[in-house]
């Protein structure tokens, strides 16, 4: 969008005429105070669109924000709307008029607000005062918006001097709401009942002097009337309440209950409705899926959550390996079941700083006299991998071996990588699984063991190198779903004396590094 002249602020003369143009790649429109303005729209041959806004016989009341926006502005980005602010200095207009929404500023929390007193001339000095107060308040002023700051519950006015006369704005009332109220509200003791139980509904009207209540309900449609009771809640500000009580509900009492309130003096009315469900018997229903296999990470806390619907309120029990769980005194396990709505519950099992022994088969059971449901899952404790050992040896056979041992859960994946030219090895080795090697220069043996007691896997991998003719940096990387760990060792040729091995410096670890490739290694996996 392009506005001509571009603004973002223009100062125009009173009684003058001024032309604004906006162009864009789609139909554009000029708006002020969310209203489209009379304008001339056109489409050029190059498929650009424009709109010309002619402001005639300008007065101070033309001061304000003007927007150019695409005609169909749904879902547009903020930068697809251009703002222009026009001042028309007019000594006959003091402060621009405000509507009631701007004069009464309601807050629900302590927050910055704007007292929107605006003038037509950006050169005017404007001050803010408490209503009927002389002292100017130290609050920043923006000629396009007003005074912005955090204000107390008071009334305020703005003052300016136009020529030789002092002009006051309307008073602005800042009020912090303690509570928001509505005229009519309907609620039920419970919206789900079993047949034979009672239905009790309350309709409350606030702030009306003389009211008539009328209830509409399923039983009424079949001609069976119930007499509501009206009373006054004297502890509250002018609340009148109508109670509809249906004893021993039947299935046919399910449906919409509407309370219509008429204020008889001025014939105002309002109504609210609520749905009541009468069920034959209670129920418990699981909501959403919980996978049969759940994971937790060792030493981290884990919350397992089950959401279900039930009526009447159920008893909830948790089991591990068929043993009932309870909140542990040591704070290792926390159980909670919350009622998140009338019939919806969330039951949570929280394992604090998970231990290996907490792996196992878990079951949640929710039940009452009419129904029950249970949900089970296996909990696996994931343990981040650790490389426990990386060692290099020179067997008599002439080959050199590197042995890497590590543990983790789930089963760790092992990656060997190597680098020949130590001087140019990059620090980071790009990992690549070894394979497809045809030469017999190297061999890889990997054994995996599952330790039942620790509930984790141990991986031992041995790399056999046939010909090492210069120093070689070998890295063993272990990786699983919850982490990775690595160690490096430098393997030197048999021909290099022991001292020389030790003297390989940090600098020597620079240089070209590569993954053990077909020409270096050959590996076999043993399961």
């Amino acid at each position: 969008l392009v506005i001509t002249p571009p603004g973002p602020e223009l100062i125009l003369n009173v009684s003058s005429t001024f032309v604004l143009t906006c162009s864009g790649s789609a139909p554009v429109v000029w708006e002020r105070m969310s209203q489209e303005l009379p304008q001339e729209m056109a489409k050029a041959q190059d498929n650009t669109f424009s709109s010309v806004l002619t402001l005639t016989n300008l007065t101070g009341l033309d001061t304000g924000e003007y927007f150019c926006t695409y005609n169909d502005s749904r879902g547009l980005e903020p930068d697809e709307r251009k703002r222009l602010y026009i001042f028309v200095p007019d000594p006959t207009v003091g402060f621009l008029p405000n509507d009631a929404e701007e004069l009464f500023i309601f807050l629900t929390e302590i927050t910055e607000i704007t007292i929107p007193c605006r003038v037509t001339d950006p050169q005017l000095v404007v001050t803010l005062h408490e209503k009927k107060g002389d002292i100017a308040l130290p609050v920043p002023y923006d000629h396009q918006r007003g005074f912005s700051g955090i204000f107390e519950d008071r009334s305020y006015i703005c003052k300016t001097t136009i020529g030789d006369r002092e002009v006051d704005s309307d008073a602005y009332y800042v009020y912090r709401l303690q509570v928001s109220s509505i005229n009519v509200s309907v609620n039920a003791v419970q919206t789900v009942v079993r047949q034979g139980e009672n239905i009790t509904l309350m309709c409350i009207v606030i702030g009306n002097e003389v009211v008539n209540f009328e209830w509409m309900y399923p039983r009424k449609e079949s001609g069976r009337l119930v007499e509501p009771v009206t009373d006054f809640l004297l502890d509250m500000p002018y609340h009148i309440r109508s109670i509809l009580h249906i004893p021993s509900a039947e299935l046919e009492d399910s449906g919409t209950y509407t309370c219509n309130v008429t204020e008889s003096v001025n014939d105002h009315q309002d109504e609210k409705a609520i749905n009541i469900t009468v069920v034959e018997s209670g129920y418990v229903r699981l909501l959403g899926e919980v996978g049969a296999l759940q994971f937790a990470e060792l030493h981290r806390s884990r919350t397992l959550q089950v959401v279900f619907e039930a009526y009447p309120p159920p008893t909830v029990l948790w089991f591990k390996d068929n043993r009932t769980l309870g909140d542990s005194s040591a704070g290792e396990i926390a159980l909670s079941t919350r009622n998140v709505s009338e019939t919806r519950y969330v039951s949570e099992l929280t394992l604090v700083r998970v231990k290996v022994a907490e792996a196992g088969h878990y079951t949640m059971r929710a039940f009452h006299e009419d129904a029950e449901v249970q949900l089970s899952f296996q909990l696996q404790i994931n343990v981040p991998v650790r490389v426990l050992e990386l060692s290099e040896s020179h067997p008599d056979s002439g080959e050199q071996t590197v042995r890497c041992r590590g543990r983790g859960m789930p089963q760790p994946n092992i990656i060997w990588s190597a680098c020949r030219d130590l001087k140019r090895c990059p620090r980071e080795l790009p990992p690549m699984l070894l394979g497809n090697s045809s030469e017999e220069e190297s061999q890889l043996e990997t054994n995996v063991t599952y330790w039942e007691e620790e509930q984790e896997f141990e991986v031992v991998s041995t790399l056999r190198l046939q010909h090492v003719d210069r120093p070689l940096s070998v890295r063993c990387t272990l990786r699983n779903a919850v982490g990775q760990d690595m160690q490096e060792v430098i393997v030197v040729p048999h021909s290099l004396p022991f001292k020389e091995q030790k003297l390989i410096s940090e600098e020597d670890l620079g240089g070209e590094q590569k993954l053990i490739s077909e020409e270096d290694l050959h590996h076999h996996h043993h399961h």
Epitope: P97, N98, D99, A100, E101, E102, L103, F104, F106, D168, D170, A171, Y173, Y175, L177, S180, S181, I182, N183, V184, I206, G207, N208, E209, F232, L234, D235, M236, P237, Y238, E263, V265, N266, D270
Partner: antibody
Amino acid sequence: QVQLVESGGGLVQPGGSLRLSCAASGFTFSSYWMSWVRQVPGKGLEWVANMNQDGTEKYYVDSVKGRLTISRENVKNSLYLQMNGLRAEDTAVYYCARDLVPPRQGDYYYYFGMDVWGHGTMVTVSS
Amino acid sequence: AIQMTQSPSTLSASVGDIVTITCRASQSISDWLAWYQQKPGKAPKLLIFKASSLESGVPSRFSGSGSGTDFTLTISSLQPDDFATYYCQQYNSYSRTFGQGTKVDIK
């Protein structure tokens, strides 16, 4: 600067009519509720009627319903009280007052009092 | 309609006195109550709104309290300018009702 000036009072016979006017200045008249309040000389104040900013809501004390009508012309910054079927008990000083009723919060009206009053105009109903 | 009852009807006091005027509503009006001061031949002047909020420009010796049905206007130290008649006024729903007034005169 903020000012309300009533006019149109006078002597009228029972059953007669009068139209009171209230001219507002120094504030954005169209943004406020307005009320009429009356006072029998030597007696207390009695609220008579009020109306919202655009005239879509009007309320009256029971004793004047059907006889007195409140109205306004925002472009003229004026409030009116059309009085028909006047009775002796309508004799009073009639005040025009600015009624601080903010826009509804939720569905509930808050209220900050009547903060600006005119000087009053006397209506005498007598035969 | 809600009735507002003020007491006393007349109160004689001296400059510097603490003056208390009470107002009772026939039913709960929460805190929707205003207090006005009126001097002979003049229009009423708003002192307090919402039971306890002081209108701008009103001296701080005036204070209001109460909620529900019982309300109080207190003048902490009566000044010569305070001899006048005081009215409470309820707002509920759409109607307003004034109390019958309390005249504060010089003892």
